[in-house]
Interface confidence: low
């Protein structure tokens, strides 16, 4: 269900380049594809090549992203290009000045001294952002949002963005500073990982993050049920980054359980993080349990 | 505070080798960026090139990518620059600067240290 | 690579002038651009970055300006400690080229 043509505007249009760049990355670290046939692999790097390049056009001169070239960039898509983009570095030749240039500016341009990284044109589509959506912890959710982003960025882009070091640590101090203050478990869960990706969730700040699970196993607030898989993915990678493999199985199954395959409307960030999660167990995870996910690739026709 | 301490005066036969460290101190080490910059005497300067410290990770200005080679070692807090094949061309003071604020620039600058070739 | 053209190369002021120096890129860098001022014998010393933030401790009286291609710095009522080269310096793909610099005087 997750190989997709991507179109329309810069919003839409990595709508449809997530869930082919997040299946591809999933069955080439599970090693499936021979389920597939290999020739499924190259059409759907195709349709990445498509959705990059397609991306490009929504690229503004200061490097930023925004749904229309006229438009006031967006501090969230920009991070999230740079997030897919990271991911997609390894699949389809990605232009580093293209990644490193929207990297540039979000440290440049949309963090505030304090570490906080600001939006000042949020997205059209809102259903694109998860559970960052009406979030009411937004300076904790976005800045952990976007620093995830940038750590995933920083291998590819810490020699031309200089500052990249220093901006990844101040995000991470405001994080720390507020996250014992935190009310949301989605919200601890994503700004969890990206502590735990800087070897910051300790201490307390972990006994919140491991205490605020429900019975052990999910991440979870009233409503959304796809915000709830997004917050548990986020969560699950906090746990792989910890080594904590006590707490995983429990989680794992629970994520498993969802049968929660991606697609549909609003679906971009769960579609995103579980299998970034899923992929990133069956990779860290010592003798861990097959997980039979029904991952059905369907190339669009032409 | 940050410093960024170089050793000291060479004088180097052409042909040989050469190599200067900066040892820093005040900070963490491996969330800072080195770069090292040349100045001919009388003259401007030069972006020689930058390495992460944490990563190892360098990149070079091309005019310099035969004749300089950047290392760093976390546990000494010391980052290198070995010139080689020296000539009277590579006659300069030759200076590490560090990173780590927002600045997209050189905060903090070692003291130089002057590399002299002659027979 | 991107050429970095500082004008003038030099230039003699008095204490309590104001000068002006520019810097002009071959290409767009957008606001990563930096000044630092090196005083005879001794490293150079970080002024401003990102076109027009001073850096900690630079006095109010040096300020810095413009986008994309053309850049000033600019230095109300000269002080004696002001003299020196200042060199312009891009932070816009490697590698992150200087200006010629300009050397400012005492009249």
């Known amino acids: 269900h997750l190989i997709v043509t991507p179109s329309g505007c810069g919003e839409q249009n990595m709508i449809g380049m997530t869930p082919t760049v997040i299946a591809v990355h999933y069955l080439d670290e599970t090693e499936q594809w021979e389920k597939f046939g290999l020739e499924k692999r190259q059409g759907a790097l195709e349709l990445i090549k498509k959705g990059y390049t397609q991306q490009l056009a929504f690229r503004q001169p200061s490097s930023a992203f925004a749904a229309f070239v006229k438009r006031a960039p967006s501090t969230w898509l920009t991070a999230y290009v740079v997030k897919v983009f990271s991911l997609a570095v390894n699949l389809i030749a990605i232009d580093s000045q293209v990644l490193c240039g929207a990297v540039k500016w979000l440290i440049l341009e949309k963090q505030k001294p304090d570490g906080v990284f600001q939006e000042d044109a949020p997205v059209i589509h809102q259903e694109m952002i998860g559970g960052l959506r009406n979030n009411n912890e937004k300076d904790m959710a976005l800045t952990a949002f976007v620093l995830i982003s940038l750590q995933e960025a920083k291998d590819i882009c810490e020699e031309q963005v200089n500052s990249l070091p220093g901006s990844i640590t101040k995000a991470g101090d405001f994080l720390e500073a507020n996250y014992m203050n935190l009310q949301r478990s989605y919200t601890v869960a994503i700004a969890g990982y990206a502590l735990a990706q800087m070897g910051r969730l300790k201490g307390p700040l972990l006994n919140k993050f491991l205490t605020t699970a429900k019975d052990k196993n999910r991440w979870e607030d009233p409503g959304k049920q796809l915000y709830n898989v997004e917050a548990t993915s986020y969560a699950l990678l906090a746990l792989l980054q910890l080594k904590d493999f006590d707490f995983v199985p429990p989680v794992v199954r629970w994520l498993n359980e969802q049968r929660y395959y991606g697609g549909g409307y609003g679906s971009t960030q769960a579609t995103f993080m579980v299998f970034q999660a899923l992929a990133q167990y069956q990779k860290d995870a010592p003798d861990h349990q097959e997980l039979n996910l029904d991952v059905s690739l369907q190339l669009p026709s032409r | 505070q940050v410093q960024l301490q170089q050793s000291g005066a060479e004088l180097v036969r052409p042909g040989t080798s050469v190599k200067v460290s900066c040892k820093a101190s005040?900070?963490?080490?491996?969330?800072?960026?080195i770069e090292w910059v040349k100045q001919r005497p009388g003259q401007g300067l030069e972006w020689i090139g930058v390495?992460?410290?944490?990563?190892?990770?360098?990149n070079y200005n091309e005019k310099f990518k035969v004749k300089a080679t950047l290392t760093a070692d976390k546990s000494s807090s010391t980052a290198y620059m070995q010139l080689s094949s020296l000539t009277s061309e590579d006659s300069a003071v030759y200076f590490c600067?560090?990173?780590?604020?927002?600045?997209?620039?050189?905060?903090?600058w070692g003291q130089g240290t002057s590399v002299t070739v002659s027979s | 690579d991107i050429q970095m053209t500082q004008s003038p190369a030099s230039l003699s002021a008095s204490v309590g002038e104001t000068v002006t120096i520019a810097c002009r890129a071959s290409?767009?860098?957008?606001?990563?651009l930096a000044w630092y001022l090196q005083k005879e014998g001794k490293s150079p010393q970080l002024l401003v970055s990102?076109?027009?933030t001073l850096a900690d401790g630079v006095p109010s009286r040096f300020s810095g300006g413009g986008s994309g291609t053309q850049f000033s710095l600019k230095i109300n009522s000269l002080q004696p400690e002001d003299f020196g080269t200042f060199y312009c310096?891009?932070?816009?793909?490697?590698?992150?080229?200087f200006g010629g610099g300009t050397k400012l005087e005492i009249k």
């Open positions: 310096q891009h932070h816009y793909g490697i590698p992150y080229t």
């Open positions: 290409e767009n860098i957008y606001s990563y």
């Open positions: 005040g900070h963490s080490f491996t969330n800072y960026l």
């Open positions: 990102k076109a027009k």
């Open positions: 390495i992460n410290p944490g990563s190892g990770g360098t």
């Open positions: 600067a560090s990173y780590y604020s927002n600045s997209y620039a050189m905060d903090y």
